[in-house]
Interface confidence: medium
């Protein structure tokens, strides 16, 4: 899925309101520098499509995240906020269905949840723009100039 | 514990540079936007710029955009900004400041900062 | 850049007195239903520290007598009851828009 057309705005008040508290409680007891960020992202759409990876897709070590508070809430935010969204995830929801029977918090999701956080971390805070400037790396940054 | 360690005063000439460092500990230092924030004697808060250090971007308060430069140095978690051309109304406490965890866009964690006298 | 006007500059107060500070910004600073004006203190010799996020949450062990309200441009910050330890400077700061601003601050003396 191509994320560029999501209102990122709208996503981002979701995940303010929510999800960032849904993810502290999924990490509570966990230290803050326990995990390396080894996952990172560029712009918004690539930071979404990193977040889609690592939320819903199962891994080796944990396969339990997409039944999560935090998971089903990043589901519903990217339905509504993003074009056509729901659509391409009707056949991978059917899959999920069938893999996951349990939700067991192993010391790799946790790790993965650390990533997930520095990520929307990204998502959220693409630095500062100048309206005209040379600074620009990213393409969807060009058309918000309104981060918030 | 997340903190930030800036290094020591500096007086220096018009004219010349100088190159502040800010030290970070207890997080982790490539997933946060860091901030430099100067305040002259008597004065407000006043935005430099910033440095994701993830991939070493920056952004700039276009009043310091020529002069100000923003760099970090991943393998010692420090973060640096060089100020050139300083002139008398360059004196000031500078700061380095982290952003917030989530995206709010506050800064939660502040250095000690670092007193720059520039005086012929 | 947006402006941010802070009243009163100075404001003369007592302990156990009620504080009301204000921020104006030249703009509204919400998006998305959310309003991006931070306050902070600061005391002499110190950094800035963070009181509200967002206009009206508490900062990290900031105590329930800081209060903070308002969306758009108008921006208040109310202490309660005033403790010998809140005289200082207070900063509104918002990041909607670039660049980053700060108001010029208000400076809450003892009377």
């Known amino acids: 899925y191509d994320f560029t057309n999501c209102d990122f705005e709208k996503i981002k008040a979701a995940y303010l309101s929510t999800i960032s508290k849904d993810l502290i409680t999924y990490m509570s007891g966990t230290k803050s520098t326990e995990f390396n960020n080894t996952v990172s992202c560029s712009n918004r759409p690539h930071c979404l499509t990193e977040i889609q990876s690592l939320t819903f897709n199962p891994t080796a070590g944990c396969a339990s995240l997409a039944k999560e508070m935090f998971a089903m809430k990043t589901k519903a935010a990217l339905a509504i906020w993003c074009p056509g969204y729901s659509e391409t995830q009707i056949n991978a929801t059917q899959a999920m269905k069938k893999a996951r029977k349990s939700k067991v918090t192993t010391n790799k999701c946790l790790e993965q949840v650390s990533q997930l956080q520095g990520l929307w971390r990204r998502f959220n805070r693409p630095l500062l723009k100048q309206q005209g400037s040379s600074d620009y790396k990213d393409d969807d940054d060009k058309h918000h100039h309104h981060h918030h | 514990e997340a903190q930030l360690v800036q290094s020591g005063a500096e007086v220096k000439k018009p004219g010349s540079s100088v190159k502040v460092s800010c030290k970070a500990s207890g997080f982790t230092f490539s997933t946060y936007n860091m901030h430099w924030v100067r305040q002259a004697p008597g004065q407000g808060l006043e935005w430099i710029g910033a440095?994701?250090?993830?991939?070493?971007?920056?952004s700039y308060n276009q009043k310091f955009k020529d002069r100000a430069t923003l760099t970090v140095d991943k393998s010692t978690s420090t973060a640096y900004m060089e100020l050139s051309s300083l002139r008398s109304e360059d004196t000031a406490v500078y700061y380095c400041?982290?952003?917030?965890?989530?995206?709010?866009?506050?800064?939660?964690?502040w250095g000690q900062g670092t007193t720059v006298t520039v005086s012929s | 850049d947006i402006v941010l006007t802070q009243s009163p500059a100075t404001l003369s107060l007592s302990p156990g007195e009620r504080a009301t500070l204000s921020c104006r910004a030249s703009e509204s600073v919400d998006n998305s239903g959310l309003s991006f004006m931070h306050w902070y203190q600061q005391k002499p010799g110190q950094p800035p520290r963070l009181l509200l996020y967002r206009a009206s949450n508490l900062g990290s062990g900031i105590p329930a007598r800081f209060s903070g309200s308002g969306s758009g441009t108008d921006f208040t910050l109310t202490i309660s009851s005033l403790e010998p330890e809140d005289f200082a400077v207070y900063y509104c700061?918002?990041?909607?828009?670039?660049?980053?601003?700060f108001g010029q601050g208000t400076k809450l003396e003892i009377k």
């Open positions: 440095i994701y250090p993830g991939n070493g971007e920056t």
């Open positions: 700061q918002q990041i909607n828009t670039d660049p980053l601003t």
């Open positions: 400041a982290r952003e917030d965890d989530y995206g709010e866009g506050y800064f939660d964690v």
